[in-house]
């Protein structure tokens, strides 16, 4: 038969950060190849990554069409060297992925502090708005465009001479905080989607940036 000795894929896993979305699976192929299909709950199956010997498939182009939809993927196993024939009626072994809703499940990428500027006893800290592959009217959208006010940033800031971290929060990409004159401060930010009730509600922390280094500016 056309699928002799092919093994169904298993451990199908979605890996997604800032909507860049890859489906991974096992096993590493021995004498077999894979094709992936993806669909929304109500849509038609679309094939991707045809007859690949990889164990991953980038499905970003499909899921960014509507990040609030729920997607399902499946991975078909074929013998190595398989060529599609119109006469083949036997369905190859396949495995379904878990359902995946990008808006709810994509991980938040590590944010970056774009700049900070001190004016007297105030510091304005700006978080870089990351671009995604989500499009609207042929324009790529930023993370803020996609999530709107659902996305907040927590700023941790502390005097270089102390260990206690103060916090501030914003649902824009800017913070304006009070600082003590003549003190140097360090900053780190974290992206958060408070409405999520799952482990992926927070990003990892940004790299720490400290006053007196190149990203900052000071004005009296």
């Amino acid at each position: 038969s056309g699928t002799t000795n092919t093994v169904a894929a298993y451990n199908l896993t979605w890996k997604s950060t800032n909507f860049k979305t890859i489906l991974e699976w096992e096993p590493k192929p021995i004498n077999q190849v894979y094709t992936v299909q993806i669909s929304t709950k109500s849509g038609d199956w679309k094939s991707k990554c045809f007859y690949t010997a990889d164990t991953e498939c980038d499905l970003t182009d499909e899921i960014v069409k509507d990040v609030k939809q729920t997607y399902l993927a499946r991975v078909f196993s074929y013998p190595a060297g398989h060529v599609e024939s119109t006469g083949s009626t036997e369905e190859p072994p396949y495995e379904n992925s878990p359902e995946f809703t990008p808006y709810l499940e994509t991980n938040l990428g590590q944010p970056t502090i774009q700049s900070f500027e001190q004016v007297g006893t105030k510091v304005n800290v700006t978080v870089q708005d990351e671009w995604t592959l989500v499009r609207r009217n042929d324009t790529f959208l930023s993370l803020r465009d996609v999530f709107g006010k659902d996305l907040i940033y927590t700023l941790y800031y502390w005097k270089s001479s102390s260990s206690g971290k103060k916090t501030a929060k914003t649902n824009t990409n800017e913070f304006l905080i009070d600082v003590d004159k003549g003190e140097n401060y360090c900053f780190s930010v974290q992206a958060v989607i408070p409405s999520r009730r799952t482990a992926n509600r927070k990003s990892t922390d940004s790299p720490v940036e400290c006053m007196g280094h190149e990203k900052g500016e000071s004005r009296e």
Epitope: I152, T154, Y156, S163, G164, K165, K166, T167, A168, K169, T170, N171, I177, D178, S188, Q190, V192, P194, R196, R197, T198, A199, R201, K202, T204, D205
Partner: antibody, heavy 120, light 107 residues
């Protein structure tokens, strides 16, 4: 169901130490911030400090700085308040509370509290 | 640190009364104010967040409002289960600070 359960309170002599635990269930503490708040008998609420278990960042109120230390063990889903050099004025019910980390950051869930009495 | 000055410290009211409690922040806290209810021997419970948003499961007779640095908790028609102590809290900056509390007693 989200739950916070404090334990470890009791009677301790001035200068002594105590470690309080705050065991969380129904959510993962690394996704939130955990605060400790205390209430002396017949008095109001006083914030003690916080920890972000995802990075270990903490801040302690001036009244306890240098004496109290907040920590967390994400594998146990538990936060801790280590209290050293205890004074009579530390006598209070100690609560842990979850901060949902939204812009307004209300404390949306609280534990039932554990009583710490500092007396000789 | 930001001070939250709450008034009155106590009040007596009857079932059905409209009750108003106020908190004044010593500096701008935007809308980062929450209100809690506490009954004797129990932990505080969240009522209002972001100055005016009713927390899930809280009866609609509770409401919150903001005018500059003044924040108000209103109970439109006091019920027997509402006799308790109420606290405001700012979480605009670290450290978060609480008001002194308002004890609502039966007249």
């Amino acid at each position: 169901e989200v739950q916070l359960v404090e334990s470890g309170g009791g009677l301790v002599q001035p200068g002594g130490s105590l470690r309080l635990s705050c065991a969380a269930s129904g959510f993962t503490i690394s996704g939130y911030i955990i605060h400790w708040v205390r209430q002396a008998p017949g008095k109001g609420l006083e914030w003690v400090g916080y920890i972000d278990p995802s990075n270990g960042y903490t801040y302690h109120a001036d009244s306890v700085k240098g004496r109290f230390t907040i920590s967390a063990d994400t594998s146990k889903n538990t936060a801790y308040l280590q209290m050293n050099s205890l004074r009579a004025e530390d006598t209070a019910v100690y609560y842990c509370a979850r901060d949902d980390q939204s812009v307004s950051s209300p404390f949306d869930y609280w534990g039932q509290g554990t009583l710490v009495t500092v007396s000789s | 640190d930001i001070q939250m000055t709450q008034s009155p410290s106590s009040l007596s009211a009857s079932v059905g009364d409209r009750v108003t409690i106020t908190c004044r922040a010593s500096q701008d806290v935007n809308t980062a104010v929450a209100w809690y209810q506490q009954k004797p021997g129990k932990a505080p419970k969240l009522l209002i967040y972001s100055a005016s948003f009713l927390y899930s499961g809280v009866p609609s007779r509770f409401s919150g409002s903001r005018s500059g640095t003044d924040f108000t908790l209103t109970i439109s028609s006091l019920q027997p289960e509402d006799f308790a102590t109420y606290y405001c809290q700012q979480h605009y900056t670290t450290p978060p600070t609480f008001g002194q509390g308002t004890k609502v007693e039966i007249k």
